[in-house]
Interface confidence: low
């Protein structure tokens, strides 16, 4: 993989270490909350971002090639923030200056730009069209967003991490 | 509608080659990852390889790394799985399909082809 295209792996793990905690913070489990322990319906589940085996984000598929499994990653973190630029989190008094919720809208767009290829056209893709969610349902949906989202941050940091700690590219002094 | 056309299989010899095609056609596919598969008689659906649309990443199964690649052609709309160093357990109907790189749920490709019949004789 080409210098250029491979990421700061170290500044990623410290990012997404960082993303994991501000998106527990976001949404601790509490305990009113368990009531609603809704299972996840088919809709859900299919239509949030997970990285799967056939991802490249195994440890053979990153010393593979990096880029299929960093890709993915990316589409995750613009589809999280997607939703969290939707109405869903509007008017969310958590999104509040310095609020965990406004940490972690900033964090992800930082995680995402430093996953940006410098050589790479800004990839565009399709987003999931939001209906209107009415008042009611919001609390629930930023639920189901925020615990899908720590479940995605959990593998990605597992990825960096791993990536940190084999595919940096040691120091090369120079003369 | 939708439409994902394999063409190039058939019979070859063993340490032979094989180039297939899986022409898409009824949407933009610029945010879809196309992944070829394979299937034998009584077993599971394999995994071989898969390209993206947008910037031409691709991933590979083990059992076919170093003598598969997989490529795509955006002005045709076409990928291509060229397929060297055949063995006879590569023998199995292949199909390529496609997903939407937002989903990332497994095995939810949307589209898949018809399938192309590959026989590797020993």
């Known amino acids: 993989v080409p210098r250029s295209s491979s990421p700061d792996w170290a500044q990623c793990q410290q990012l997404s270490r960082n993303l994991c905690m501000l998106a527990w913070n976001a949404h601790a489990p509490a305990g009113h909350m368990n009531l609603l322990r809704e299972e996840e319906d088919e809709e859900t589940k299919n239509n949030v971002p997970r990285i799967q085996c056939e991802d490249g984000c195994d440890p053979q598929g990153l010393k593979d090639n990096s880029q299929f499994c960093l890709q993915r990653i990316r589409q995750g973190l613009a589809f999280y923030k997607h939703l969290l630029d939707s109405d869903i989190f509007k008017g969310e008094p958590a999104l509040l200056p310095d609020s965990p919720m406004e940490q972690l809208h900033t964090s992800l767009l930082g995680l995402s730009q430093l996953l940006q290829p410098e050589d790479h056209p800004r990839e565009t893709q399709q987003m999931p069209s939001l209906s209107s969610s009415q008042q009611w349902q919001r609390p629930l949906l930023r639920s189901k967003i925020l615990r899908s989202l720590q479940a995605f941050l959990a593998i990605a940091a597992r990825v960096f991490a791993h990536g940190a700690a084999t595919l940096t590219e040691p120091l090369v002094p120079t003369a | 509608e939708v439409q994902l056309v394999e063409s190039g299989g058939g019979l070859v010899q063993a340490g032979g080659s094989l180039r297939l095609s899986c022409a898409a056609s009824g949407r933009s596919f610029s945010d879809y990852a196309m992944g070829w598969f394979r299937q034998t008689p009584g077993k599971e659906r394999e995994f071989v390889a898969a390209i993206s649309w947008s910037d031409g990443s691709t991933y590979y199964a083990n059992s076919v790394k170093g003598r598969f690649t997989t490529s795509r052609d955006n002005a045709k709309n076409t990928v291509y799985l060229q397929m060297n160093n055949l063995k006879p357990e590569d023998t199995a109907v292949y199909y390529c399909?496609?997903?939407?790189?937002?989903?990332?749920?497994?095995?939810?490709?949307?589209?898949w082809g018809q399938g192309t019949q590959v026989t590797v004789s020993s």
């Open positions: 399909a496609a997903r939407r790189l937002v989903y990332y749920s497994d095995p939810k490709y949307d589209y």
